[in-house]
Interface confidence: low
């Protein structure tokens, strides 16, 4: 018996060939001997089967002795043995229809799990193998699960269902909803304007939801909500904003926040959360602000940084075009009785300057 695999929702064509290359009488029946379709001369006739409105044939092929059965919009329950009766002989074809669907939605938040469920006809024992866009293979039976989806899992998943040495392939487009970066750090001199950007790693036609930026200043004992906003069809509208600092927010995507000036009391880390409509859970992006200040008080030249700096960062004070006078893995360095000239305060990581502030020391007469 010939086995044909079909995909739910697709169209399948079951072939039936007579030895005579001409139009002769034929019938297609199901395993209950209920007539699906046949012919009377050059006319197509249909029987009382459940397939009635979804079954068809190709009259143009009858003259060549080919009498296909076409079933449109396949359903799992169409899985059956179909019998073609032609020239006093019977050809049997077993049709097995499979469906593969993603749990609830194909737009999933980063960190959520994807479950692919295989619908299969009773009595079948298929195996499934799926390949993710980043080349990861997963195997399973009726369900396949991938926990902790990552950004690289966005794209087309190709799944192969294997049954009776036959294969049928499904392609499922998965969109992982996430920010492009999990974390970012902004280095600013005191008084400079600060720009925070939160680009999304996906595009959808309609994007609606709401979000909030919580901020934990290094100097504060608890975190504080700096701004809450709504997102409607990619348009941003601010709901609430603190008076200090008074953030400004761009009206269009990508989400963009402006802090009028970097001050030591604002240095710290924030967590921007975005809850998308009809999605359980939220998108997160961490943002960090490091603020530098260089000051001269009487005979003391001081350079300080506030905010989340890594312990390997180096803070240095140097006179322009000279070797560093002081260089420490600390958050504050100073020089007593500095020489006159342009001093540079540098925050660097393995020799790469992240932040620089210049201060002019005048000669003392």
């Amino acid at each position: 018996k010939k086995v044909v695999l079909g995909k739910k929702g697709d169209t399948v064509e079951l072939t039936c060939t007579a030895s005579q290359k001409k139009s002769i009488q034929f019938h297609w029946k199901n395993s209950n001997q209920i007539k699906i379709l046949g012919n009377q001369g050059s006319f197509l006739t249909k029987g009382p089967s459940k397939l009635n409105d979804r079954a068809d044939s190709r009259r143009s092929l009858w003259d060549q002795g080919n009498f296909p059965l076409i079933i449109k919009n396949l359903k799992i329950e169409d899985s059956d043995t179909y019998i073609c009766e032609v020239e006093d002989q019977k050809e049997e074809v077993q049709l097995l229809v499979f469906g593969l669907t993603a749990n609830s939605d194909t737009h999933l938040l980063q960190g959520q799990s994807l479950t692919l469920t295989l619908e299969s006809p009773p009595g079948s024992s298929p195996s499934v193998q799926c390949r993710s866009p980043r080349g990861k293979n997963i195997q399973g039976g009726k369900t396949l699960s991938v926990s902790q989806l990552e950004l690289q899992d966005s794209g087309t998943w190709t799944c192969t269902v294997l049954q009776n040495q036959k294969k049928v392939e499904f392609k499922i487009d998965i969109v992982v909803l996430a920010f492009q970066k999990a974390s970012s750090i902004v280095y600013k001199k005191e008084g400079e304007q600060v720009e925070f950007s939160f680009p999304l790693a996906f595009t959808v036609e309609k994007l609606t939801g709401s979000g909030e930026l919580w901020w934990q200043a290094e100097r504060a004992s608890s975190s504080k909500s700096w701004i809450t906003f709504d997102l409607k069809n990619k348009e941003v509208s601010v709901k609430r904003v603190t008076q200090d600092p008074k953030l400004q927010m761009g009206k269009k995507l990508p989400l963009h926040l402006t802090l009028p000036q970097a001050l030591p009391q604002y240095a710290g880390s924030g967590n921007l959360t975005l809850a998308l409509e009809a999605k359980t859970g939220k998108l997160h992006q961490e943002v960090n602000l490091v603020v530098m200040r260089a000051t001269q008080l009487q005979k003391n030249l001081t350079c300080e940084v506030w905010g989340p700096t890594s312990p390997k960062l180096m803070l240095s004070l140097k006179l322009e075009n000279k070797e560093a006078k002081v260089s420490k893995r600390e958050k504050a360095v100073w020089v007593l009785n500095p020489e006159a000239g342009m001093w540079q305060c540098l925050l660097s990581d393995s020799g790469q300057v992240l932040l620089e502030s210049n201060i002019k020391v005048l000669p003392t007469w």
Epitope: S210, K239, T280
Partner: antibody, heavy 122, light 107 residues
Amino acid sequence: QVQLVQSGAEVKKPGASVKVSCKVSGYTLTALSMHWVRQAPGKGLEWMGYFNPRDGETIYAQKFQGRVTMTEDTFTDTAYMELSSLRSEDTAIYYCATGGDSDYYYYYMDVWGKGTTVTVSS
Amino acid sequence: ETTLTQSPAFMSATPGDKVNISCKASQDIDDDMNWYQQKPGEAAIFIIQEATTLVPGIPPRFSGSGYGTDFTLIINNIESEDAAYYFCLQHDNFPYTFGQGTKLEIK
């Protein structure tokens, strides 16, 4: 502080329609989602649907599809729920509940009205 | 449709007691469970959000636990003002569904 004030009790005949109102104070209705829930005598609470102003979407529970209409008058900050083709089993207390000023969860029902009793009897 | 089975339907407690009210979901709903308190003739009050988070302004003697299918509302050191009807709500999928409710009486 969001508050919801519902219209008074109604007595209706089978086959008629009823329109229950829910007036919002302390906040603008356009920023709130409005859910409608009912409780028949001796039965549990039943969610009927909600209006989500963020995209103008109304979702009705399948059981009430075709019989219920949820609307809003943003000028008066009043939400309405109309139920048609009333039958005796629609006798219940009808509640409006809002997502309040939740920053994210438009589906939260964090503020409730006191309910409107609707009696369907011939 | 997710069915919520709440138990007990009725319970009696003495001031100072600890009470547990259970709500079981017919399918996995993650932590998408809210709890409410309602007194006769009054509007329902939102007490627990996302299964375990106490709503601001609610006394800390109320707490919630659970994830997936089994959830519990816990009231420690019960007070006479806690006499009310308590119900759970799942907002994981449409239609949102409620538990049958628990009537708590204080002796």
